[in-house]
């Protein structure tokens, strides 16, 4: 969490941002809140990006003002106009690109004063893994697949029964470039699995960490997966 203040004493307002990550090809949110004003027409929101000379987005007098928007953001940005009055200056970014990564500034002007805060935005690709029993294999084998990752992640297997065991010798991981030539499909195979055990396939890069669990018993197979974004901190 980053909290920024305006520069000149009583003419300053608090602006708060939260570092976040965007999944390329999908929509993302750059979070920013500020001390609200009672009059929408008195609020100006400017989003800027370090190294980009045009604006990312501008909202003033109750509507978007995009004449000075940089072309790299053309048609891809929106604020939540109905929430500006309550202090929400968050930006919706459509179709996140790898090049959207960087330092953004949320700059606010209201009748109370000015304030700004920076936000680190990371971009990459991350997806939920799915672990299945591979019945085609000669021995008991598990297959962990996740469709989209970038940058290339690490894959680690773990098991509930053999905690702390190193499965690198009995697993094989491959990365297959997807058609858009950026993201990759992750496939990891774990050999010689034993019944009545829970195995976890953990995929991680500097943006996200995802885990796919599978519990194999003689009577049933139970699966669970979850994904966590890393380094989401407020400013």
């Amino acid at each position: 969490l980053i909290i920024g203040f305006g520069i000149s004493g009583r003419h300053s307002i608090t602006v708060t941002t939260v570092a976040s990550a965007g999944n390329i090809g999908e929509d993302g949110i750059l979070s920013c809140t500020f001390e609200p004003d009672i009059k929408l027409s008195d609020i100006v929101i400017q989003w800027l990006k370090e190294g980009v000379l045009g604006l990312v987005h501008e909202f003033k007098e109750g509507k978007d003002e995009l004449s000075e928007q940089d072309e790299m953001f053309r048609g891809r940005t929106a604020v939540f106009a109905d929430q500006v009055i309550v202090g929400n200056a968050s930006l919706r970014l459509k179709n996140v690109q790898l090049t959207d990564a960087g330092t953004y500034k949320c700059y606010i002007i209201t009748s109370k004063g000015k304030g700004n805060a920076n936000l680190e935005y990371k971009t990459g690709a991350f997806s939920m893994p799915e672990v299945n029993v591979d019945y085609n294999a000669s021995s008991e084998t598990l297959r962990c697949e996740a469709p989209r990752w970038f940058p290339q992640p690490t894959v680690v297997w773990a098991s509930q029964v053999d905690q702390g065991a190193n499965f690198s010798e009995v697993s094989n991981t491959s990365f297959e470039l997807n058609s858009e030539n950026v993201t990759m499909k992750v496939v990891s195979v774990l050999y010689n699995v034993t019944i009545n055990n829970t195995y976890s396939c953990m995929i991680e890069n500097d943006i996200a960490k995802a885990t796919g669990d599978i519990k194999v018993t003689e009577s049933e197979i139970k699966r669970r997966s979850h994904l966590q974004l890393l380094n989401s901190k407020a400013s």
């Epitope: 190294g51 000379l53 045009g54 995009l66 004449s67 000075e68 928007q69 940089d70 072309e71 053309r74 048609g75």
Partner: antibody, heavy 116, light 106 residues
Framework: QVQLVQSGAEVKKPGASVKVSCKAS????????MYWVRQAPGQGLEWMGR????????VYAQKLQGRVTMTRDTSTSTVYMELSSLRSEDTAVYYC?????????WGQGTLVTVSS | DIQMTQSPSSLSASVGDRVTITCRAS??????VNWYQQKPGKAPKLLIY??SRLHTVPSRFSGSGSGTDFTLTISSLQPEDFATYYC?????????FGGGTKVEIK
């Protein structure tokens, strides 16, 4: 006031290269993009590309890709446009122009003549 | 690339006439259109940006339009207005220009 001053006219032989300079003054050099536009004799305006003076990142017109190079020197607030493998159809007045989504002001123009 | 089709390519008019120049974009470009005036041997000069916003020019100049169709209007032509006018889109690179309209004295 904001001013862009370009280097003088050049006469070049086909196959040669030319480097045109554009010196900016009266504003923060790194605050806006610098564009290059050319105009062949009696013809319209052709967008050539742009440079970000902060980062040096460039975007070039596809038809000039591989032949055009835009650079900048932040210490002298100057941008350069170099065009290689010149041909007769490159004979034109070359302009630099400052801006984000519109161009203002423009340099005075540099006439480059390509002739054997 | 976005094509900008400007018409007419030339026109003859008298001082005091109302002159209209149109520009059509090959795709929706919102209001990312600029108009420039160029006199012989001189660099182009910005007249209107963002389709309708006057730069530092007299109020007889006006611009309108959004999407694909744009217009530059000179309400009462003055002697100093005889020049060539160009539209330009700045929606996406390359920022292409129209072919130009030469306004000549009748």
């Amino acid at each position: 006031q904001v001013q862009l001053v370009q280097s003088g006219a050049e006469v070049k032989k086909p196959g040669a290269s030319v480097k045109v300079s554009c010196k900016a003054s009266g504003y923060t050099f790194t605050a806006q993009y610098m564009y290059w536009v050319r105009q062949a004799p009696g013809q319209g305006l052709e967008w050539m590309g742009r440079i970000n003076p902060t980062s040096g990142n460039t975007v070039y017109a596809q038809k000039l890709q591989g032949r055009v190079t835009m650079t900048r020197d932040t210490s002298t607030s100057t941008v350069y446009m170099e065009l290689s493998s010149l041909r007769s159809e490159d004979t034109a007045v070359y302009y630099c122009a400052r801006g984000i989504n519109w161009f203002d002001p423009w340099g005075q123009g540099t006439l480059v003549t390509v002739s054997s | 690339d976005i094509q900008m089709t400007q018409s007419p390519s030339s026109l003859s008019a008298s001082v005091g006439d109302r002159v209209t120049i149109t520009c059509r974009a090959s795709q929706n470009i919102d209001t990312y259109v600029n108009w420039y005036q160029q006199k012989p041997g001189k660099a182009p000069k910005l007249l209107i940006y963002a389709a309708s916003r006057l730069h530092t020019v007299p109020s007889r100049f006006s611009g309108s339009g959004s999407g694909t169709d744009f217009t530059l209007t000179i309400s009462s032509l003055q002697p100093e207005d005889f020049a060539t006018y160009y539209c330009q889109q700045s929606y996406t690179s390359p920022f292409t220009f129209g072919g130009g309209t030469k306004v000549e004295i009748k």
